[in-house]
Protein backbone atom coordinates (compact mmCIF):
# COMPACT_ATOMS: atom_id res chain seq x y z
CA UNK A 1 0.00 0.00 0.00
CA UNK A 2 2.67 2.14 0.51
CA UNK A 3 3.11 4.99 -2.50
CA UNK A 4 5.95 6.98 -1.27
CA UNK A 5 8.71 6.16 -3.45
CA UNK A 6 11.85 5.21 -1.77
CA UNK A 7 14.47 7.57 -1.09
CA UNK A 8 17.37 7.33 -3.43
CA UNK A 9 19.95 10.24 -3.48
CA UNK A 10 21.99 10.24 -5.97
CA UNK A 11 25.33 8.36 -5.77
CA UNK A 12 28.34 10.26 -4.06
CA UNK A 13 25.81 12.52 -2.19
CA UNK A 14 26.10 12.11 1.76
CA UNK A 15 23.05 10.23 2.44
CA UNK A 16 22.35 11.68 6.16
CA UNK A 17 22.70 15.32 4.45
CA UNK A 18 20.73 14.28 1.26
CA UNK A 19 17.92 13.24 3.54
CA UNK A 20 17.70 15.11 6.17
CA UNK A 21 18.40 18.79 6.11
CA UNK A 22 17.55 20.63 9.26
CA UNK A 23 15.43 23.46 9.05
CA UNK A 24 15.29 25.57 12.80
CA UNK A 25 12.44 28.02 11.64
CA UNK A 26 9.45 26.50 12.86
CA UNK A 27 6.29 26.83 10.18
CA UNK A 28 3.55 28.36 11.76
CA UNK A 29 -0.20 26.64 11.77
CA UNK A 30 -2.11 27.49 8.91
CA UNK A 31 -4.04 29.54 10.56
CA UNK A 32 -3.95 32.06 13.81
CA UNK A 33 -5.93 30.66 16.64
CA UNK A 34 -8.58 32.74 17.33
CA UNK A 35 -10.67 31.98 20.59
CA UNK A 36 -14.31 30.64 19.82
CA UNK A 37 -16.83 33.07 21.23
CA UNK A 38 -19.80 31.25 21.10
CA UNK A 39 -20.68 30.64 24.60
CA UNK A 40 -22.34 27.68 24.37
CA UNK A 41 -19.05 25.81 23.40
CA UNK A 42 -17.05 27.89 26.18
CA UNK A 43 -17.61 25.42 29.12
CA UNK A 44 -15.24 22.97 31.34
CA UNK A 45 -17.50 19.75 31.30
CA UNK A 46 -17.13 17.58 34.37
CA UNK A 47 -16.36 14.39 32.26
CA UNK A 48 -14.73 12.90 28.74
CA UNK A 49 -11.16 13.93 27.91
CA UNK A 50 -9.08 16.18 29.42
CA UNK A 51 -9.44 19.21 26.76
CA UNK A 52 -13.07 19.23 27.31
CA UNK A 53 -12.36 19.10 31.34
CA UNK A 54 -10.36 22.13 31.34
CA UNK A 55 -10.98 25.65 32.63
CA UNK A 56 -9.30 26.54 29.46
CA UNK A 57 -10.85 24.07 27.05
CA UNK A 58 -10.12 23.14 23.58
CA UNK A 59 -10.74 21.38 20.44
CA UNK A 60 -8.59 20.01 17.70
CA UNK A 61 -8.10 21.04 14.22
CA UNK A 62 -6.98 18.75 11.59
CA UNK A 63 -3.77 19.71 9.47
CA UNK A 64 -3.29 17.36 6.53
CA UNK A 65 -0.31 17.46 4.55
CA UNK A 66 0.23 14.42 2.20
CA UNK A 67 3.77 15.40 1.68
CA UNK A 68 5.04 15.65 5.18
CA UNK A 69 5.44 12.91 7.97
CA UNK A 70 3.10 12.80 9.98
CA UNK A 71 0.66 13.37 7.58
CA UNK A 72 -1.84 14.46 10.24
CA UNK A 73 -1.07 16.88 12.80
CA UNK A 74 -3.67 18.32 15.28
CA UNK A 75 -3.78 21.65 16.24
CA UNK A 76 -5.45 22.35 19.15
CA UNK A 77 -7.68 25.81 19.02
CA UNK A 78 -8.94 27.64 22.69
CA UNK A 79 -12.64 27.63 22.86
CA UNK A 80 -13.09 30.25 25.55
CA UNK A 81 -10.74 33.87 25.50
CA UNK A 82 -10.82 34.16 29.46
CA UNK A 83 -10.99 30.59 31.79
CA UNK A 84 -13.94 29.41 32.75
CA UNK A 85 -14.58 28.96 36.43
CA UNK A 86 -13.90 25.89 38.20
CA UNK A 87 -17.44 26.27 40.65
CA UNK A 88 -19.69 26.60 37.61
CA UNK A 89 -17.75 25.20 34.43
CA UNK A 90 -19.61 28.09 32.36
CA UNK A 91 -18.89 31.61 33.76
CA UNK A 92 -15.48 32.99 32.17
CA UNK A 93 -12.86 34.04 34.71
CA UNK A 94 -11.71 37.90 33.14
CA UNK A 95 -8.83 37.60 35.83
CA UNK A 96 -7.29 34.52 33.70
CA UNK A 97 -6.51 33.68 29.86
CA UNK A 98 -6.83 31.49 27.79
CA UNK A 99 -3.52 30.59 25.82
CA UNK A 100 -2.25 27.96 23.36
CA UNK A 101 0.74 26.30 24.10
CA UNK A 102 3.15 25.49 21.48
CA UNK A 103 5.44 23.22 20.66
CA UNK A 104 8.27 22.45 17.76
CA UNK A 105 7.59 19.20 16.27
CA UNK A 106 10.14 17.49 14.12
CA UNK A 107 8.51 16.62 10.70
CA UNK A 108 9.64 14.80 7.58
CA UNK A 109 8.63 16.28 4.25
CA UNK A 110 8.69 14.17 0.84
CA UNK A 111 10.82 16.53 -1.76
CA UNK A 112 11.58 15.49 -5.18
CA UNK A 113 15.64 14.49 -5.32
CA UNK A 114 17.58 15.54 -7.67
CA UNK A 115 20.71 14.08 -9.48
CA UNK A 116 23.99 14.45 -11.40
CA UNK A 117 23.02 17.09 -14.01
CA UNK A 118 19.44 17.96 -12.37
CA UNK A 119 17.91 15.14 -13.36
CA UNK A 120 14.96 13.67 -10.89
CA UNK A 121 15.88 10.57 -8.47
CA UNK A 122 13.04 9.81 -6.98
CA UNK A 123 11.99 11.37 -2.80
CA UNK A 124 14.14 12.50 -0.19
CA UNK A 125 13.24 13.89 3.06
CA UNK A 126 13.75 16.75 4.39
CA UNK A 127 13.68 17.68 8.28
CA UNK A 128 12.10 20.69 9.52
CA UNK A 129 10.54 22.18 12.68
CA UNK A 130 6.84 22.21 12.67
CA UNK A 131 4.69 24.72 15.50
CA UNK A 132 2.19 22.60 16.72
CA UNK A 133 -0.43 24.13 19.42
CA UNK A 134 -1.04 21.11 21.79
CA UNK A 135 -3.23 22.59 24.33
CA UNK A 136 -5.14 25.90 26.02
CA UNK A 137 -3.03 26.73 29.28
CA UNK A 138 -5.54 29.20 31.77
CA UNK A 139 -2.41 31.89 32.81
CA UNK A 140 -2.43 35.36 34.17
CA UNK A 141 -2.34 38.34 32.49
CA UNK A 142 0.59 39.69 30.99
CA UNK A 143 0.75 42.91 33.06
CA UNK A 144 1.93 45.64 30.67
CA UNK A 145 4.62 48.16 32.67
CA UNK B 1 -18.17 -6.90 8.82
CA UNK B 2 -17.79 -2.89 8.51
CA UNK B 3 -21.19 -1.18 9.06
CA UNK B 4 -22.32 2.22 9.81
CA UNK B 5 -26.16 3.08 10.74
CA UNK B 6 -27.57 6.34 10.65
CA UNK B 7 -30.46 7.40 11.99
CA UNK B 8 -33.56 7.80 9.87
CA UNK B 9 -35.54 10.32 7.82
CA UNK B 10 -36.21 13.90 9.45
CA UNK B 11 -38.42 16.40 8.39
CA UNK B 12 -37.89 19.58 10.00
CA UNK B 13 -39.11 23.08 10.46
CA UNK B 14 -37.15 25.93 8.64
CA UNK B 15 -35.11 27.48 11.83
CA UNK B 16 -34.84 24.75 13.55
CA UNK B 17 -31.73 22.50 14.71
CA UNK B 18 -31.29 18.40 14.26
CA UNK B 19 -29.01 15.82 14.94
CA UNK B 20 -28.16 12.72 12.59
CA UNK B 21 -26.29 9.72 14.51
CA UNK B 22 -24.00 7.46 12.66
CA UNK B 23 -23.33 4.32 14.78
CA UNK B 24 -20.33 2.22 13.64
CA UNK B 25 -19.81 -1.82 13.92
CA UNK B 26 -17.09 -3.86 12.53
CA UNK B 27 -14.17 -1.85 14.05
CA UNK B 28 -12.15 0.05 15.66
CA UNK B 29 -14.00 3.02 15.60
CA UNK B 30 -10.99 5.31 17.16
CA UNK B 31 -9.01 3.95 14.30
CA UNK B 32 -10.66 5.31 11.66
CA UNK B 33 -11.84 9.74 11.00
CA UNK B 34 -15.07 9.38 9.88
CA UNK B 35 -16.03 11.99 7.05
CA UNK B 36 -19.60 13.51 6.44
CA UNK B 37 -21.08 13.97 2.32
CA UNK B 38 -23.96 16.24 1.51
CA UNK B 39 -26.03 14.96 -1.95
CA UNK B 40 -28.57 17.17 -3.00
CA UNK B 41 -31.29 16.32 -5.22
CA UNK B 42 -29.69 12.94 -5.90
CA UNK B 43 -27.12 14.73 -7.79
CA UNK B 44 -23.94 16.45 -6.60
CA UNK B 45 -21.80 15.22 -3.68
CA UNK B 46 -20.26 18.12 -1.20
CA UNK B 47 -18.08 17.03 1.60
CA UNK B 48 -19.27 18.55 4.45
CA UNK B 49 -16.32 18.05 7.13
CA UNK B 50 -14.89 14.93 8.87
CA UNK B 51 -13.49 14.26 12.79
CA UNK B 52 -11.25 11.82 14.47
CA UNK B 53 -13.36 9.38 17.30
CA UNK B 54 -9.74 9.18 18.92
CA UNK B 55 -9.22 13.23 19.85
CA UNK B 56 -12.38 14.75 18.61
CA UNK B 57 -10.18 16.22 15.88
CA UNK B 58 -11.83 18.16 13.31
CA UNK B 59 -11.87 19.56 9.50
CA UNK B 60 -14.68 21.42 7.69
CA UNK B 61 -15.25 22.75 4.33
CA UNK B 62 -15.24 26.28 5.17
CA UNK B 63 -19.23 26.23 3.31
CA UNK B 64 -20.58 24.18 6.30
CA UNK B 65 -18.64 26.05 9.16
CA UNK B 66 -21.66 27.20 11.39
CA UNK B 67 -24.04 25.29 9.93
CA UNK B 68 -22.94 22.00 10.53
CA UNK B 69 -20.96 20.24 13.90
CA UNK B 70 -18.93 17.14 13.97
CA UNK B 71 -18.65 15.02 17.60
CA UNK B 72 -18.39 11.44 18.91
CA UNK B 73 -19.26 9.56 21.49
CA UNK B 74 -16.34 7.08 21.35
CA UNK B 75 -18.57 4.83 24.20
CA UNK B 76 -21.09 3.94 21.58
CA UNK B 77 -19.41 4.01 18.73
CA UNK B 78 -20.90 7.15 17.30
CA UNK B 79 -20.55 9.80 15.30
CA UNK B 80 -22.50 12.37 15.21
CA UNK B 81 -23.60 15.48 12.98
CA UNK B 82 -25.45 18.25 14.26
CA UNK B 83 -27.21 20.50 11.33
CA UNK B 84 -28.12 24.37 12.62
CA UNK B 85 -30.36 26.98 11.70
CA UNK B 86 -31.79 24.94 8.98
CA UNK B 87 -33.40 26.31 5.69
CA UNK B 88 -34.94 24.95 2.33
CA UNK B 89 -31.05 24.87 0.91
CA UNK B 90 -30.39 21.67 3.41
CA UNK B 91 -32.77 19.42 2.21
CA UNK B 92 -30.62 16.65 1.01
CA UNK B 93 -29.72 13.37 1.68
CA UNK B 94 -26.54 12.89 4.30
CA UNK B 95 -23.69 10.22 4.26
CA UNK B 96 -21.18 9.14 6.79
CA UNK B 97 -18.75 7.73 5.37
CA UNK B 98 -15.30 6.02 7.13
CA UNK B 99 -11.78 7.21 5.85
CA UNK B 100 -10.16 4.19 4.67
CA UNK B 101 -6.09 4.73 4.86
CA UNK B 102 -2.66 2.57 4.83
CA UNK B 103 -0.87 4.98 6.41
CA UNK B 104 0.88 6.60 3.64
CA UNK B 105 -0.71 8.44 0.14
CA UNK B 106 -4.27 6.58 0.15
CA UNK B 107 -7.20 8.51 1.96
CA UNK B 108 -10.54 7.12 0.74
CA UNK B 109 -14.07 6.45 2.03
CA UNK B 110 -14.37 2.89 2.03
CA UNK B 111 -17.86 2.04 3.85
CA UNK B 112 -20.61 4.20 3.42
CA UNK B 113 -23.63 4.56 5.75
CA UNK B 114 -27.15 4.26 4.09
CA UNK B 115 -27.52 7.95 4.13
CA UNK B 116 -30.09 10.06 5.99
CA UNK B 117 -32.85 11.90 4.19
CA UNK B 118 -33.46 15.60 5.61
CA UNK B 119 -36.59 17.69 4.45
CA UNK B 120 -36.79 20.80 5.36
CA UNK B 121 -40.47 22.53 5.08
CA UNK B 122 -42.99 24.23 7.01
CA UNK C 1 -10.85 25.02 -2.92
CA UNK C 2 -10.00 22.44 -5.78
CA UNK C 3 -12.40 22.48 -8.59
CA UNK C 4 -13.16 18.82 -10.22
CA UNK C 5 -14.40 18.57 -13.65
CA UNK C 6 -15.67 15.65 -15.19
CA UNK C 7 -16.77 14.87 -18.78
CA UNK C 8 -18.84 13.49 -19.87
CA UNK C 9 -21.86 14.32 -18.06
CA UNK C 10 -23.94 11.75 -19.07
CA UNK C 11 -23.48 8.95 -21.68
CA UNK C 12 -24.97 6.17 -23.36
CA UNK C 13 -23.15 3.06 -24.81
CA UNK C 14 -24.06 -0.61 -25.78
CA UNK C 15 -22.87 -3.87 -23.45
CA UNK C 16 -19.54 -4.88 -24.39
CA UNK C 17 -18.24 -1.31 -25.41
CA UNK C 18 -15.40 0.23 -23.89
CA UNK C 19 -15.87 3.62 -21.90
CA UNK C 20 -13.84 6.06 -20.52
CA UNK C 21 -14.84 9.02 -18.41
CA UNK C 22 -12.42 11.65 -17.36
CA UNK C 23 -11.58 13.99 -14.75
CA UNK C 24 -9.83 17.53 -14.83
CA UNK C 25 -8.65 19.07 -11.34
CA UNK C 26 -8.28 22.51 -11.31
CA UNK C 27 -4.54 22.20 -9.60
CA UNK C 28 -2.20 19.29 -10.23
CA UNK C 29 -3.16 16.53 -7.62
CA UNK C 30 -0.79 14.28 -7.85
CA UNK C 31 -1.88 10.97 -8.44
CA UNK C 32 -4.96 11.46 -5.30
CA UNK C 33 -7.51 10.86 -6.71
CA UNK C 34 -10.80 8.36 -5.77
CA UNK C 35 -13.39 6.82 -7.86
CA UNK C 36 -16.47 6.59 -6.53
CA UNK C 37 -19.96 4.16 -8.15
CA UNK C 38 -23.76 5.04 -7.23
CA UNK C 39 -26.32 2.96 -8.84
CA UNK C 40 -29.91 4.37 -8.76
CA UNK C 41 -31.18 4.64 -5.46
CA UNK C 42 -28.25 3.41 -3.41
CA UNK C 43 -25.49 4.19 -1.97
CA UNK C 44 -21.89 6.01 -3.26
CA UNK C 45 -18.96 2.72 -3.18
CA UNK C 46 -15.26 2.95 -3.81
CA UNK C 47 -14.05 1.70 -6.99
CA UNK C 48 -10.89 2.99 -7.32
CA UNK C 49 -8.22 5.19 -5.52
CA UNK C 50 -5.09 6.77 -5.17
CA UNK C 51 -5.63 6.87 -9.42
CA UNK C 52 -5.31 3.10 -10.42
CA UNK C 53 -5.53 1.15 -7.28
CA UNK C 54 -8.95 -1.05 -7.22
CA UNK C 55 -10.51 -1.51 -4.21
CA UNK C 56 -11.35 -5.09 -2.78
CA UNK C 57 -13.90 -6.83 -4.70
CA UNK C 58 -14.04 -4.28 -7.69
CA UNK C 59 -14.33 -6.07 -11.05
CA UNK C 60 -10.97 -6.29 -12.98
CA UNK C 61 -12.77 -4.63 -15.96
CA UNK C 62 -12.80 -1.33 -14.36
CA UNK C 63 -9.53 0.63 -14.27
CA UNK C 64 -8.15 4.19 -13.57
CA UNK C 65 -4.99 5.84 -15.36
CA UNK C 66 -3.43 9.46 -14.82
CA UNK C 67 -0.97 11.70 -12.84
CA UNK C 68 -1.27 15.80 -12.32
CA UNK C 69 -4.39 17.26 -13.54
CA UNK C 70 -5.94 14.85 -16.10
CA UNK C 71 -7.69 11.44 -14.99
CA UNK C 72 -9.45 8.61 -16.62
CA UNK C 73 -11.31 5.86 -15.48
CA UNK C 74 -11.40 3.10 -18.25
CA UNK C 75 -14.85 0.26 -18.37
CA UNK C 76 -13.03 -2.51 -20.89
CA UNK C 77 -16.27 -4.02 -21.32
CA UNK C 78 -19.52 -2.52 -20.41
CA UNK C 79 -22.29 -5.16 -18.60
CA UNK C 80 -25.80 -4.15 -17.39
CA UNK C 81 -25.22 -4.13 -13.98
CA UNK C 82 -22.56 -1.14 -14.47
CA UNK C 83 -25.27 1.69 -15.23
CA UNK C 84 -24.73 4.05 -12.47
CA UNK C 85 -23.30 7.58 -11.76
CA UNK C 86 -19.19 7.89 -11.41
CA UNK C 87 -18.11 10.26 -9.56
CA UNK C 88 -14.07 11.64 -9.10
CA UNK C 89 -12.82 12.90 -5.82
CA UNK C 90 -9.56 14.34 -5.00
CA UNK C 91 -8.02 14.12 -1.61
CA UNK C 92 -4.74 16.17 -2.48
CA UNK C 93 -6.23 19.12 0.25
CA UNK C 94 -8.52 19.58 2.05
CA UNK C 95 -11.54 20.35 1.51
CA UNK C 96 -12.10 17.33 0.10
CA UNK C 97 -14.27 18.23 -3.64
CA UNK C 98 -15.80 15.84 -6.46
CA UNK C 99 -16.74 15.70 -9.69
CA UNK C 100 -19.70 16.83 -10.48
CA UNK C 101 -20.73 12.99 -11.69
CA UNK C 102 -20.89 11.23 -15.32
CA UNK C 103 -24.34 8.88 -15.62
CA UNK C 104 -23.41 6.23 -17.22
CA UNK C 105 -26.50 4.35 -19.73
CA UNK C 106 -27.14 1.23 -21.76
CA UNK C 107 -27.95 1.67 -24.83
Known amino acids: YSHWPSCCPSKGQDTSEELLRWSTVPVPPLEPARPNRHPESCRASEDGPLNSRAISPWRYELDRDLNRLPQDLYHARCLCPHCVSLQTGSHMDPRGNSELLYHNQTVFYRRPCHGEKGTHKGYCLERRLYRVSLACVCVRPRVMG | EVQLQQSGPELVKPGASMKISCKAS????????MNWVKQSHGKNLEWIGL????????SYNQNFKGKATLTVDKSSSTAYMELLSLTSEDSAVYYC???????????????WGQGTSVTVSS | DIQMTQSPSSLSASVGDRVTITCSAS??????LNWYQQKPGKVPKLLIY???SLHSGVPSRFSGSGSGTDFTLTISSLQPEDVATYYC?????????FGQGTKLEIK
Open chain 2, 97 to 111: AREGYDGYLYFAMDY
Open chain 3, 50 to 52: YTS
Open chain 2, 26 to 33: GYSFTDYT
Open chain 3, 89 to 97: QQYSKLPYT
Open chain 2, 51 to 58: INPYNGGT
Open chain 3, 27 to 32: QGISNY
